[in-house]
């Protein structure tokens, strides 16, 4: 399945804790990129191996 | 594939509460998505009265936050809608739907809710 | 809230034509604009989501286009089974919000 990526809704602005929110649009999801030593579904997480 | 049907009294009288009920067949609501209550009013406007998410977490319109509850039955693999204080205002017809971050892709079949004396 | 305007409540059209029903948001929805058929008998299915996507099982006679704040569905080549009403829904901002509908007659 290929997965489109474009910026979240204005609802989900704060969705990522540590990171930028993405929509995947045929899934009708949010997906998180992580800022750099931030993991986790909603980068919620500090990467203690970073 | 994933169906939805409402149920629940067609007549209920002012001041009194509506409950209804989603039975959900085909998906379980606790693997994802949020679970929705629509209404479609006489003249066609449709209002989305909340969800709860597949977690259990819920939200609600603001138009409705203080007369509203939804809630689940996960044994049962249904989930609920509880309005207080009804008013003539609230006869409509009542959906529940599927959906996920922007949109709702599954209905049920709708049920037609009169509030009157 | 964010207010969805659909300034046609009802449309007479021929079978075969080219049909297009407006939608437009009180403020820029970024492309979160759904577009529903509500059949007579009371059956509601979504037909096209992010403006232009078609939902599965959709008739490709049906497509959407837009940005900003107005958007449109339209029908290429009408078929009695379109005769509905239609609604778009903004998914930009909770609470979420729709039009008025458009119903859709045949001539």
């Known amino acids: 399945v290929v997965s489109h990526f474009n910026d979240c809704p204005d609802s989900h602005t704060q969705f990522c804790f540590h990171g930028t929110c993405r929509f995947l649009v045929q899934e009708d999801k949010p997906a998180c990129v992580c800022h750099s030593g931030y993991v986790g579904a909603r980068c919620e997480h500090a990467d203690l191996l970073a | 594939d994933v169906q939805l049907q409402e149920s629940g009294p067609g007549l209920v009288k002012p001041s009194q509460s509506l409950s209804l009920t989603c039975t959900v067949t085909?998906?379980?609501?606790?693997?994802?998505y949020a679970w929705n209550w629509i209404r479609l009013f006489p003249g066609n406007k449709l209002e989305w009265m909340?969800?709860?998410?597949?977690?259990?977490?819920?939200s609600y319109n603001p138009s409705l936050k203080s007369r509203i509850s939804i809630t689940r039955d996960t044994s049962k693999n249904q989930f609920f809608l509880k309005l207080n204080s009804l008013t003539t205002d609230d006869t409509a017809t009542y959906y529940c739907?599927?959906?996920?971050?922007?949109?709702?892709?599954?209905w049920g079949q709708g049920t037609l809710v009169t509030v009157s004396a | 809230d964010i207010q969805m305007t659909q300034t046609t409540s009802s449309l007479s059209a021929s079978l075969g034509d080219r049909v297009t029903i407006s939608c437009r948001s009180s403020?820029?929805?970024?492309?979160?604009l759904n577009w529903y058929q509500q059949k007579p008998d009371g059956t509601v299915k979504l037909l096209i989501y992010?403006?232009?996507r078609s939902h599965s099982g959709v008739p490709s006679r049906f497509s959407g286009s837009g940005s900003g704040t107005d958007y449109s569905l339209t029908i290429s080549n009408l078929e009695q089974e379109d005769i509905a009403t239609y609604f778009c829904?903004?998914?930009?901002?909770?609470?979420?919000?729709f039009g008025g509908g458009t119903k859709l007659e045949i001539k």
């Open positions: 085909g998906y379980s609501i606790t693997s994802d």
């Open positions: 909340g969800f709860i998410n597949y977690s259990g977490n819920t």
């Open positions: 992010y403006t232009s």
């Open positions: 403020q820029d929805i970024r492309n979160y």
């Open positions: 739907a599927r959906g996920g971050l922007s949109r709702f892709p599954y």
């Open positions: 829904q903004q998914g930009n901002m909770f609470p979420f919000t």
